[in-house]
Interface confidence: low
């Protein structure tokens, strides 16, 4: 049996040893680097937090996020005639969510099976890259959307092709930036075999030499550049937006807009409080603790924060709802199992019968559908 060098290894906070041991396979004896983890790490990797709580949350995110973002993308691409900058940003937001959420069945299976990754190195890297990529894409597209919403209130000029082209350019630049900043996640070996638990982890255990310095520097840079700066822009946009709305006209129409804008602000604030702030803060604190103390005491909080960050895929549809008239129509009718065409026909028929009030209702077998939106 070949025994390798004993270098200390730490996972996200998982402390142990690298043991270059012979691992017997069907094809004979192959030498590979295997990791032994300490009992704290084992308790996390075998405990209910990772094997029960995480898959439950990820299942909810998948069940809610896949259809809602799928519908949103379809609405923005094929059911929205005018491609306003807001529509472009929301379409990208929905695409980012979908690219992350489609891998969740593998993530759920991984956690349910005791954090055992059986799908190969490449898929693990894709999953992790898309996981973090989605979070940072969401932050950036949300920032663009927030700044754009403020801009619309300040300059309520009509839709121009030039503005749409700028939005497309910005979106492509964001995708390119995210691709570049997540390259380290695709390059680093993310799967580690732990014989003590007879599992292969995906991202949960990482080599110390990579982890201690590099991971702290990496996530600190991302937290400053792709979280704090966009968060400041978003907050500024909303503070200015609230000021503008407070001094604007108080008619019914503007009141509706004001309420929707407030709901959008509350939704985005909730997303920052639940999804983005805890995860970015704890990513930095967690890796700082490992770097400075050799152990992270916030590991459980860190896992919960990263898990909650995926809820942005469930919260984003609320943003679409408050911003997009078309998505609102399709969402309402999807929930009522009606096609938009049917409702439009109802509206036409009612209008022709001189029901020209601002909000008329169509009643049929105890179901009331508001026909003006």
């Amino acid at each position: 049996t070949i025994q390798g060098t004993n270098r200390s290894s730490k996972g996200r906070s998982l402390i142990g040893k690298v043991d270059g041991t012979s691992h017997v396979t069907g094809k004979g004896v192959t030498v590979e680097t295997v990791f032994s983890v300490d009992e704290f790490s084992a308790s996390v990797l075998t405990g209910k937090l990772t094997t029960v709580f995480l898959p439950i949350v990820y299942t909810i995110v998948f069940v809610v996020g896949l259809p809602s973002n799928g519908m949103a993308l379809w609405v923005f691409l094929f059911r929205t005639k005018k491609k306003h900058p807001a529509v472009i940003y929301m379409a990208n937001l929905a695409l980012a969510d979908l690219l992350s959420v489609i891998w969740f069945p593998l993530k759920i299976a991984y956690h349910i099976h005791g954090n055992n990754w059986i799908y190969g190195e490449a898929l693990c890297n894709v999953l992790i890259g898309f996981f973090y990529g989605n979070m940072y894409c969401s932050i950036l597209f949300m920032t663009c959307l927030s700044v754009q919403r403020y801009w619309v209130i300040v300059n309520p000029m009509g839709h121009s092709r030039k503005k749409a082209n700028i939005a497309i350019g910005i979106s492509l630049a964001i995708w390119l930036l995210i691709l570049l900043v997540t390259i380290p996640l695709y390059v680093v070996k993310q799967t580690i075999f732990i014989p003590a638990l007879n599992i292969t982890t995906c991202h949960d255990v990482l080599p110390e030499q990579l982890l201690v310095g590099d991971m702290f520097n990496y996530f600190l840079s991302l937290a400053i550049g792709v979280f704090l700066f966009p968060a400041f822009l978003t907050a500024s946009a909303y503070v200015l937006m609230i000021r503008m709305l407070r001094s604007s006209a108080m008619d019914e129409n503007s009141e509706k807009k004001r309420k929707r804008a407030i709901k959008l602000i509350v939704t985005v604030l909730a997303m920052y409080l639940i999804c983005f702030t805890p995860s970015n803060l704890l990513l930095v604190v967690h890796y700082f603790l490992i770097k400075s103390q050799g152990q992270s005491h916030v590991y459980a909080l860190y896992i919960v924060a990263l898990c909650l960050s995926t809820l942005n895929s469930c919260i984003d549809p609320f943003v679409y709802y408050f911003v997009s008239h078309d998505f609102r129509d399709h969402a309402k009718n999807a929930l009522l199992c009606r096609s938009v065409r049917t409702v439009k026909q109802m509206q036409v028929s009612l209008t022709s019968k001189k029901h020209s009030r601002k909000s008329s209702s169509y009643s049929s077998s105890s179901t009331t559908v508001k026909t003006s939106y």
Epitope: T1, Q3, N6, S8, I15, G16, K17, D19, T21, S22, H23, V24, V34, S36, D38, E39, F40, S41, A42, S43, T46, F193, P195, A196, L197, N198, G294, Q295
Partner: antibody, heavy 118, light 106 residues
């Protein structure tokens, strides 16, 4: 019920190889790790090495150059081989079972006394 | 290698007396494990994960500590507690034991 039983020679010549067998019953070697621990007369316990459920091994760095642990899952046996024995290797050799989690030896064999002497 | 230093090496206690054994690690360990061994018998798991009692262990036994300093306590010594107690770490290979503390009845 769970049992571990060590077997092997009671006396070994210096510079020779020690071969011990730990025969287990009441559990599967693919579900539990098995470790070897020794105890020289009147002294403390020394962890020697472990064979994990997956079949790979980890050793005490002081012994790894002359120690080898293997197993036969079909026979429910774990083997210890240690070469170049010296008189200071005289000890009671125990095999002990450890689960995936929590980490502790919940069952031990009764031990086999091995004397290294010419 | 993490070296575990137990103190005292030997200890004599009267029935009803409180007994404390300490175990210091040369570097930080996540948890400490304790085993009891009576003369001529195999060791038995006594305390795992620093403070959890193994099955069948009376609740007069307790464990505590963190980092590099851990302790094992018997709140009220009883005759059957006379044995040698070993601390053990699973934090990194080699998974070392302490030299042991021999607890005798006074």
């Amino acid at each position: 019920q769970v049992q571990l039983k060590e077997s092997g020679p009671g006396l070994v010549q210096p510079s020779q190889t020690l071969s011990l067998t730990c025969t287990v019953s009441g559990f599967s070697l693919t579900n539990y790790h098995v470790s070897w621990v020794r105890q020289p007369p009147g002294k403390g316990l020394e962890w020697m090495g472990i064979i994990w459920t997956g079949g790979s091994t980890a050793y005490n760095s002081l012994l790894k150059s002359r120690l080898s642990i293997s197993r036969d899952t079909s026979k429910s046996q774990v083997f210890l081989k240690m070469n170049s024995l010296q008189t200071e290797d005289t000890a009671t050799y125990y095999c002990a079972r450890r689960g995936l989690y929590p980490y502790y030896f919940d069952y031990w064999g009764q031990g086999v006394m091995v004397t290294v002497s010419s | 290698e993490i070296v575990l230093t137990q103190s005292p090496t030997t200890l004599a206690a009267s029935p009803g007396e409180k007994v404390t054994i300490t175990c210091r690690a040369s570097s930080r360990v996540s948890n400490m494990y304790w085993y009891q061994q009576k003369s001529g018998a195999s060791p038995k798991a006594w305390i795992y994960e620093t403070s959890k009692l193994a099955s069948g262990v009376p609740d007069r036994f307790s464990g505590s500590g963190s980092g590099t300093s851990y302790s094992f306590t018997i709140s009220s010594m009883e005759t059957e507690d006379a044995a040698t107690y070993y601390c053990h770490q699973w934090t990194s290979t080699p998974y070392t034991f302490g030299a042991g503390t021999k607890l005798e009845l006074k």
